[in-house]
């Protein structure tokens, strides 16, 4: 805490400008009006304040807004955002996507901090669901964002938002998450034709049931091994050799290279040797 001291004569700040970098911490506390600071927050980022000086400015805003900052201030926090604690952020009501983008920009290139996680959580809860624009923004800054959500949280994603999801956004998702996302993707892309549908649904297939895989095998999709290896083992096991051959198309010979990895290994063990031999790959059941 900075002690309350009177502002020396002639040092009262009429505006937020570069002259303030020469103020000592106690002078900033005494001579900068909190309301002025709040209205001129956009200037703070252009001024090379020290971390200690930023602490004083944060303290002034905390005193002015004990219940949490208004969005007009939050949007212009800039690097001062890095000084906020998750507890501070929980008091905020952020509703504008522009505000969210501005704060995510400050943290760009870094891993998701507890502050950012809290901010996103507050924002999404405020909106009630993960809409397409929000998802677009979040995955642009954090490609792994979607896979950091629990299956319960993912259930609030509307099918329309699935259009914003890129394949790389699903890289770190586990089967339980894909189980939630796959039916939404199936619904979102249902009006697309065969080949276009497969391109879009491919990344979500780790949540697909056997009957959907059987249906895909009739559509000449040529699934690659990277996708096949992400399929649920329980969904792959009932597939026949002929169905897998149709599903993989020219990629079927890749089964040989993966014959000891799940789910290929488990699938091979379920097949009759005569059927496996028709592939000509030397797979041993």
């Amino acid at each position: 805490e900075v002690e309350k001291t009177a502002c020396p004569s002639g040092k009262k700040a009429p505006e937020i400008d570069e002259s303030l970098i020469f103020y000592k911490k106690w002078e900033l506390e005494a001579c900068v009006d909190a309301a002025l600071l709040a209205t001129q927050m956009d200037r703070v980022n252009a001024i090379p304040f020290t971390y200690e000086q930023l602490d004083v400015l944060k303290h002034k805003l905390d005193e002015l807004y004990p219940q949490g900052y208004p969005e007009s201030v939050i949007q212009h926090l800039g690097y001062l955002f890095l000084k906020m604690s998750p507890e501070d952020i929980r008091k905020w009501n952020v509703t504008s996507l522009e505000t969210l983008k501005a704060l995510l920009e400050v943290n760009k290139g870094h891993e998701m901090s507890p502050q950012v996680a809290t901010l996103i959580d507050r924002f999404v809860k405020g909106r009630g669901q993960l809409d397409k624009d929000t998802l677009d923004t979040l995955t642009a800054f954090y490609p792994g964002y979607l896979c950091s959500l629990s299956p319960e949280e993912l259930s609030s994603v509307p099918p329309s938002s699935i259009w914003a999801v890129r394949p790389q956004d699903l890289d770190t998702c586990d089967p339980r998450q894909l189980d939630v996302l796959y039916p939404k993707a199936r619904l979102a892309f249902q009006n697309m034709n065969g080949s276009e549908y497969f391109v879009k649904i491919q990344s979500f297939l780790g949540g697909a049931p056997t009957e959907d895989l059987k249906a895909l095998s009739q559509q000449n999709v040529s699934m690659d091994l990277a996708t096949f290896m992400k399929l649920r083992t329980d969904a792959v096991l009932p597939l026949t050799v002929a169905e897998v051959q149709k599903l993989l198309g020219p990629h079927v010979e890749g089964l040989k290279a993966e014959e000891r990895h799940r789910p290929v290994r488990d699938w091979i063990l379920r097949q009759r040797q005569d059927d496996l031999d028709t592939l000509g790959l030397g797979l041993q059941g």
């Epitope: 890289d171 990277a226 890749g254 030397g282």
Partner: antibody, heavy 119, light 106 residues
Framework: EVQLQQSGPELVKPGTSVKILCKAS????????MDWVKQRHGQSLEWIGD????????IYNQKFEGKAILTVDKSSSTAYMELRSLTSEDTAVYYC????????????WGQGTTLTVSS | QIVLTQSPAIMSASPGEKVTMTCSVN?????IYWYQQKPGSSPRLLIH???NLASGVPVRFSGSGSGTSYSLTISRMEAEDAATYYC?????????FGGGTKLEIK
Amino acid sequence: EVQLQQSGPELVKPGTSVKILCKASGDTFTAYNMDWVKQRHGQSLEWIGDINPNTDSTIYNQKFEGKAILTVDKSSSTAYMELRSLTSEDTAVYYCARRKLGRGYFDYWGQGTTLTVSS
Amino acid sequence: QIVLTQSPAIMSASPGEKVTMTCSVNLSVRYIYWYQQKPGSSPRLLIHDTSNLASGVPVRFSGSGSGTSYSLTISRMEAEDAATYYCQQWSSFPYTFGGGTKLEIK
């Protein structure tokens, strides 16, 4: 540009363990298995085993079963190989190498990690 | 396990000369892969699926063969080709490499 960046050289005592890391960048980590290969000085290459980042499924050359433990951390696109109960026979350069799922060859290799086991 | 025998173990060639090295397999395999390794460096993929050139590999390199007999050819030797060359198979477990052919420049 695809890169596999391995951890630095290690000098360890017999009987101990060591963990080598391999951080991948420049492509989709989960579309490839991560394999590990051993090369003793002046000798050929020996395949140790590989791991599928999607399922954490591992396969090992029987010769290295119990000697090497392979793991991955998908969130950081990093593969690890722990070598246990080290002896002078384990002194070698260890490479991580990327293998596209369904393919039999290694299209990118790490720079190698030199392990020296000596008392 | 499948054993890959490379020959010769060591060879030398003059710049511009044609070079051929072989990889013999004790059991029939579907494909062979070739790698080049220079001293102090990691192996580099040269040829996959027996005869397909890897990305960025000069066209003077070529691979051929089937069953149990495979070869790597350099149509015109260059100084930068001095290295050790390894063949590898992925048809049978465990996956194995040949002992290598060391190619020196005359």
